[in-house]
Interface confidence: medium
C-alpha cells in the first residue's frame, strides 16, 4: 500500500517530481491494455514485456512521487500529454483516459478527487 499522504507541495515541486520519474512503463502498460495483440502500434515493442510487469514498474515509478492529490494528477496528465499524438481517434483517446483513471486503483493508490485529463490544448 502506498505510504501515508505527505504535505502537498506546490505545483512546481510536483512538476519537478513528474519530470524526475520514468513514466514510460505507465504509458506502455496502458497502451498494452488498449491495443491488446494488435500489431499496428509499433512505437514500443509492446509484446516484449508482460503487461503485469509493466504495471508493477509503473506503480513503482509513481510510488517515488510525493503522495498527494495534485502530484498524482500531474503525473496522469503528463502521461496523457506524452501519448496524445499517438492516439489515433476519439475512441482510442477515451479508452486511454479510462485506463488512466484506473491506474491509481491498480497501484493501490487513491485516485485524485479532482483531475482533468482533457489536456494538450483540446487535442486529446
Amino acid at each position: 500500500m502506498r505510504r501515508e499522504r505527505g504535505r502537498q507541495g506546490d505545483s512546481s515541486s510536483c512538476e519537478r517530481q513528474v519530470d524526475r520519474v520514468n513514466l514510460k512503463p505507465c504509458e506502455q502498460h496502458i497502451m498494452q491494455r488498449i491495443m491488446g495483440e494488435q500489431e499496428q502500434y509499433d512505437s514500443y515493442d509492446i509484446r516484449s514485456t508482460r503487461s503485469s510487469d509493466q504495471q508493477q514498474r509503473c506503480c513503482d515509478e509513481l510510488n517515488e512521487m510525493e503522495n498527494t492529490q495534485r502530484c498524482m494528477c500531474e503525473a496522469l496528465q503528463q502521461i496523457m500529454e506524452n501519448q496524445c499524438d499517438r492516439l489515433q481517434d476519439r475512441q482510442m483517446v477515451q479508452q486511454f483516459k479510462r485506463e488512466l483513471m484506473n491506474l491509481p486503483q491498480q497501484c493501490n493508490f487513491r485516485a485524485p478527487q479532482r483531475c482533468d485529463l482533457d489536456v494538450s490544448g483540446g487535442r486529446c
Partner: antibody
Amino acid sequence: QVQLQEAGPRLVKPSQTLSVTCTVSGASITIGGYYWSWIRQHPGKGLEWMGYIYSNGRTYYNPSLKSRIAMSIDTSKNQFSLKLTSVTAADTAIYFCAREAWETPLWGQGTLITVSS
Amino acid sequence: DIQMTQSPSSLSASVGDRVTITCQANQDIVNSLNWFQHKPGTAPKVLIYDASKLETGVPSRFSGSGSGTHFTFTISGLQPEDFATYFCQQYENLPHTFGQGTKLEIR
C-alpha cells in the same frame, strides 16, 4: 446526465440488518476511476462518510463502522448496495449514495431510514 | 480522523447581504476542501472545490478561500434561492469528514 437514486425500507427493527441500494443511470458503474460512496446524516446532525466501493469491488470503510458495514456492486443492474448489521436507533439517518473522484461529486437525494421497533 | 469545525451553525441574513462561513481543520488538509449547498429533499450540490475553485455553472457570487487548516466560504449579494444549508468536506485523508453545517435563514 448521470443520476443516483437510493432505495430501501423506510423502517428497520433494532438488531436487524439495514439494506439500501443505489441505482445509477446515465453512466456505467463499471467505468473505472470512480468511487461509489455512502454518506449518512443523522436527524438534525452532521454528515458521516461511511466508505466507498470501487468498480472492481475493492472497498474502504470508515473505521468507526468497519465491524458492521459491507458494500457490494451489481454491474448487471448498474447498482451498488450498503448493508449495516446490528442496527440501533443511532443508525436512524438519511442515507445518501454518491460518486466521487476525478470530477464533480454527484449525490443522490437521500432516503430516510428509521430504526425502531 | 480529521475533525472539521464549521461556524456558525446558523445564520440569519437578508437578500443582498454578504455572508461568510468558516471551516477549520484540526490538521493540515492543504486545499482538499469542498463546499456544498443542500436543500431538503434534494441532492447536495458542490459549489466550490479545491478550497477556492468555482464549480462549473455556479454563480460568481459564491467564493471560497483558505489553505492548510482555515477556510472561508462567502456569498456576496444573497439571492432568495441561496437560503439553504451549507457544509464543508475535506478529502485530503480517508475517511472524508464534514463540517456540522450552517443553516442560512431569511431574516
